[in-house]
């Protein structure tokens, strides 16, 4: 028997549900009786699914996975993952087995859009050209982490004086700060990119300064 | 219309630096970003770098800092790049163009003619 | 850096004939950060389509793009005389902004 999964990884946004594609070619007259089907942790070993002596055993795996039953016979052996979480992220074997066996692994990239940034000013009024700022790009809920980006107004990269951090709340998921510091000219625009480097996904968030009043 | 009037052609000997220039006009020089590009002889382009013509902030392609300054003279709708320490790998066709994308979207919508750079004792 | 890598370098059309350039990035790019030039002997590269699918000012409807990942294409879908140039990709999803090596038009 050959296994067959896909090369390239499958990525699952946040609180979808994800399938992790497994295919063998049955030989003619195959029953499901024969058939010892498993899904486990390619690190930890950790069994995920399984289905033998006939029939589906479930899941092991937080009760969040399921086969599709009618497509085995087939020799469809792909497993769905329900409401994806980070913690999800890594590869999975896929093991058959009929008189011979076989296996083979397919990864899982968790992934999760970043919000629009919003963008803040320190300080933020009686502001001059030659005034040193603080502009903070603030962008909320995104898995993995991001790349962040800044640029002047016409588009050219500001590197100098950056500090960008990334926290992990308790689901996982990664707020971004990034902190640019620059003195003010006789007026500007200042914008961000936060990038989801998975997603290609782009979240842009600008402040222009042109005396009074700010535009954001 | 719209265009980028590069300098004439260079001819010169190891060693030495060079100063092209860029003279925009047409539009607002100061509204848009410059960007220089090297075309070597039957080679592919090469970004040099990016100069805000505002307020002149600047940004290189790591493989040219040293080689390349980039400046900028308002008054005059004028970009220049200065070129140092020339070599014969320093020989093409270097291309001034406008930034026309979005901040993070780079595009070039107008070119400059060229300048032929040529390093020869 | 992201290479991007043309193919074929160079090609030979007839006029009439539907032709395709591919630009394959080294890693995955958005489409809206991918560009192309065309450039014909002794003069400066021109803008032909940007964001993968839109059509410059000036450019002839002929033109089109397409593409998304690491996986882009220029097609011209009936070839003129006229289109016999170098035509490159650029990227800029990564730094620094990069261009792919070019393919070489000739008209049979």
């Known amino acids: 028997v050959e296994v067959q999964v896909s090369e390239d990884p499958v990525v699952a946004l946040v609180d979808t549900d994800a399938t992790l594609r497994c295919s063998f070619s049955p030989e003619p007259g195959f029953s499901l009786a024969q058939l010892n089907l498993i899904w486990q942790l390619t690190d930890t070993k950790q069994l995920v699914h399984s289905f033998t002596e006939g029939r589906d055993q479930g899941s092991a795996y937080s009760n969040r996975t399921a086969l599709f039953p009618d497509l085995l016979v087939q020799g469809n052996a792909s497993l769905r993952l329900q409401r994806v979480r980070v913690t999800d992220e890594g590869s999975y074997t896929c093991f058959v087995s009929i008189q011979d066996f076989d296996s083979a692994a397919v990864s899982l990239q968790v992934a999760a859009p970043y919000s629009k940034p919003s963008m803040t000013l320190e300080p933020n009024k009686d502001l001059r050209p030659g005034n040193m700022v603080t502009i903070t790009c603030s962008s909320y809920q995104g898995y993995p982490e991001a790349e962040v980006f800044w640029k002047d107004g016409q588009g050219v990269p500001l590197t100098g004086n950056v500090t960008t951090s990334q926290m992990a709340n308790e689901r996982g998921l990664f707020d971004v700060h990034s902190v640019l510091r620059v003195v003010l000219g006789a007026n500007g625009t200042y914008s961000c990119l936060v990038r989801n480097p998975v997603l290609q996904q782009d979240a842009h968030g600008s402040v222009t300064i042109t005396g009074q009043p700010l535009t954001f | 219309q719209v265009q980028l009037q590069q300098s004439g052609p260079e001819l010169v000997r190891p060693g030495v630096s060079v100063k092209i220039s860029c003279k925009g006009s047409?539009?607002?020089?100061?509204?848009?970003?410059i960007h220089w590009a090297k075309q070597g002889h039957a080679k592919s382009l090469e970004w040099i770098g990016i100069?805000?013509?505002?307020?002149?902030?600047?940004n290189y392609n790591q493989n040219f800092k040293g080689k390349a300054t980039m400046t900028v003279d308002k008054s005059s709708s004028t970009a220049y790049m200065e070129l140092t320490r020339l070599t014969s790998e320093d020989s093409a066709i270097y291309y001034c163009?406008?930034?026309?994308?979005?901040?993070?979207?780079?595009?070039?919508?107008?070119w400059g003619q060229g300048t032929t750079l040529t390093v020869s004792s | 850096d992201i290479v991007l890598t043309q193919s074929p370098t160079t090609m030979a059309a007839s006029p009439g004939e539907k032709i395709t350039i591919t630009c394959s990035a080294s890693?995955?790019?958005?489409?809206?950060?991918l560009h192309w030039y065309q450039q014909k002997p002794g003069f400066s590269p021109k803008l032909l389509i940007y964001?993968?699918?839109n059509l410059a000012s000036g450019v002839p409807a002929r033109f089109s793009g397409s593409g998304s990942g690491t996986s882009y294409s220029l097609t011209i879908s009936s070839v003129e005389a006229e289109d016999a140039a170098t035509y490159y990709c650029?990227?800029?999803?990564?730094?620094?902004?990069?261009f792919g090596a070019g393919t070489k038009l000739e008209l049979k």
């Open positions: 163009a406008r930034n026309y994308g979005s901040s993070f979207n780079w595009y070039f919508d107008v």
């Open positions: 964001s993968t699918s």
């Open positions: 650029q990227q800029y999803s990564g730094y620094p902004l990069t």
């Open positions: 890693s995955s790019i958005s489409s809206n950060y």
């Open positions: 100069i805000n013509t505002y307020n002149g902030n600047s």
């Open positions: 047409g539009y607002t020089f100061t509204d848009y970003a």
